[in-house]
Structure formats: structure tokens, C-alpha cells
């Protein structure tokens, strides 16, 4: 009886199992019982990344500079181009279709994790004893100045946005 299912890397057509084309190649003509599947390599700037029976290769992705994109990994006949974002920007999705500017951490917040081409800045509130008085995509929360180590006393308490103000100790009269 003619086959109704085929092995891995084969496909069923006209009651016959034909070999799929390997990654990097496209289908030109199905096999017959006299000749094997005819496949051709993908052209320049084209790819197919699976065993397939596609009659056309896919175009390599274009990393559009106007959208802040640049090439992270060049495409091959078997893989698509991988894009990432320019410095200071990050991808809006896993597919990295567009980029947005890294967020900055507002005063009172410090950078917990610096942004990459694929992830945004992660901010954290400055805990007691730490402060950030700038809006930054790089600066962590800084510890309050230790007045004691300078033989000074706290004249004004610190907050999450301001450092403590140190001053001289009162002298005994």
C-alpha cells in the first residue's frame, strides 16, 4: 500500500515520501520514484532555517538604523540576521523590531541593573542610608556621607534624594 506517513525529514506528496530540503535550501521540484527531491541553495540575503519544502527562501531581516537598530549577528543561508539596539537604546520586544531610549532612574531611585540592547534599566528606591539626587541611567544609590568619620556631626538629615549635611561639633564654652 502507498505510505500514509513519512519518516523525519520527509514529506508526503502524491502517495510518496519525499526528502525535505535541508536548511539553507529551497524546494525546486518534488521527488518522483525515479529522482530525488530537487533543492537549490538560498540566494544572497536569503535564508531558510529548517528542513523544509518551501519554494521561496525568506529575506534576511534589515536592521533599520532610523529605528535605532544595528546588526548583532549577520544572517546566513540557514539563519536570519539578528538585530540589537544602538548604545543608549533597548529592544521593545524579544524579536527586537524597534528600540526605545533607556529609562533613567529619577532622584530617590538608583540603577539596580544597567540596561542592555535587549533590556531596559531596572531602578530601585534608595533605602535608608542611601540617596540619589540625579536622574540617571547609570548611577546607583550612594551611601550618605558618614559625618563621624570626618569628626563632624549631622547638621541636616539625609533623605532618599539628598545627602546628609555635616557640620562642626559644638564646642564647650
Amino acid at each position: 500500500e502507498p505510505p500514509t506517513a513519512c519518516r523525519e525529514k520527509q514529506y508526503l506528496i502524491n502517495s510518496q515520501c519525499c526528502s525535505l530540503c535541508q536548511p539553507g535550501q529551497k524546494l525546486v521540484s518534488d521527488c518522483t520514484e525515479f529522482t530525488e527531491t530537487e533543492c537549490l541553495p538560498c540566494g544572497e540575503s536569503e535564508f531558510l532555517d529548517t528542513w523544509n519544502r518551501e519554494t521561496h527562501c525568506h529575506q534576511h531581516r534589515h536592521c533599520e538604523p532610523n529605528q535605532g537598530l544595528r546588526v548583532k549577528k549577520e544572517g546566513t543561508a540557514e539563519s536570519d540576521t539578528v538585530c540589537t539596539c544602538e548604545e543608549g537604546w533597548h529592544c521593545t520586544s524579544e524579536a527586537c523590531e524597534s528600540c526605545v531610549l533607556h529609562r533613567s532612574c529619577s532622584p530617590g531611585f538608583g540603577v539596580k541593573q544597567i540596561a542592555t540592547g535587549v533590556s531596559d534599566t531596572i531602578c530601585e528606591p534608595c533605602p535608608v542610608g542611601f540617596f540619589s539626587n540625579v536622574s540617571s541611567a547609570f548611577e546607583k544609590c550612594h551611601p550618605w556621607t558618614s559625618c563621624e568619620t570626618k569628626d563632624l556631626v549631622v547638621q541636616q538629615a539625609g533623605t532618599n534624594k539628598t545627602d546628609v549635611v555635616c557640620g562642626p561639633q559644638d564646642r564647650l564654652r
Epitope: S15, S29, T32, E33, F34, T35, E36, E38
Partner: antibody, heavy 117, light 107 residues
Amino acid sequence: EVQLLESGGGLVQPGGSLRLSCAASGFTFSSYAMSWVRQAPGKGLEWVSGIGSYGGGTYYADSVKGRFTISRDNSKNTLYLQMNSLRAEDTAVYYCARYVNFGMDYWGQGTLVTVSS
Amino acid sequence: DIQMTQSPSSLSASVGDRVTITCRASQSISSYLNWYQQKPGKAPKLLIYAASSLQSGVPSRFSGSGSGTDFTLTISSLQPEDFATYYCQQYGRNPPTFGQGTKLEIK
């Protein structure tokens, strides 16, 4: 035992017709693709035509396309080659062969076709 | 059609010799190649299929190799019954085509 026996060859004038037969035995004929291969006197082998199993497609070499017709009768375990508009260059021994995995594993003894006036 | 070119066209060798016949395709055919042996007045016999697989019942002194466009048939130690004509045949593209043959003669 697999056997393929060709018949129907002979002398024919240019422009004439001939029908070759190939009687198969010793295997399930309908399950196999079959083909005709020819060999001109003192020359090499030339694949002429093939027919798929289970009434599959038919295929021809460019040199015979439109003039030759391959067919099969699974109830009679017989392969045919109808040859029309014969030319001198069709003179050859014609072999029928069984196909398996893209190779011809069993061949008949051949039948001679001579096209001459 | 794909052209298959065999070399040499003829070859003289002695019993016990190691013999290599080559076959070149006009374009890549992966490993889609068969080898046949034909003796005078007889039908061809399948020796090697898929470039390197030995057909059942064929002696192990016959071997095949190659892929893409260049293929070889090797007989490791010639026996008297090996003197014959050898043909390669591609099945990578329609229609299947044969090489012109290599005649192996006794030296």
C-alpha cells in the same frame, strides 16, 4: 524469483510504430515503479521512460517525449512502451527494469528494436 | 539534463589490481548516484546505490564514495569476473542520466 521478460521488438520502418511489453513475475508488480532503458548498438545506456507504482506519474526523456507512451496493467503484471514516429536513432536494445529506492535492481534480458528502411 | 562524465573511458588492469573509476556530474547531485556493471550481451546489474551503499549480494571488494559532483567506484582487488563495462547514473534531477561508461579490460 524476480523475472522480467521483454517482447515486441523487431524491424520497423522510420515513422512506424511498435509496442513493447514486459511481463513481470516473482514480486508484487503493482508496488514497484518500472522503467524502460535503451542501449544503441555499441553505445551506453539511456533512460527512456518511467511509470510510478500505484498508477503513479509517467516520465520521459526529452528525446522520446510526445512519441513514446509508457503504461502498465497491474492485473496482467505487464509494463508497456508504445513507440510511435520511430526514427533511426531509436534503434537499440530496450530493457525494462524494476525500480527500488531510485535504483534499478532487476532488469530484463532486453528486446532489439531496429528502425530502418 | 545533468551530464555525467566518466573517466577513464577504458582501462586495462590485471587480476588483483586495485582499480578506481571516477564519475563527475555537471552540477551537484548530493549523494544521488548509482553504479552498474554490464557484461557483453547481458543486462546491467546494480552494484552501488546512494553513492556508497552496497547492493545486496554484491561482493565487498566493490565500494563507492563521493558527493556533490565527484564520485568514485573502487574495486579493491580485481577478480576475473569483474572485467566489464561500468556505468554511473544520477537521480538528483529529472530525467535520470547515465555516464558514457568505463570499459575495464584484462591487461
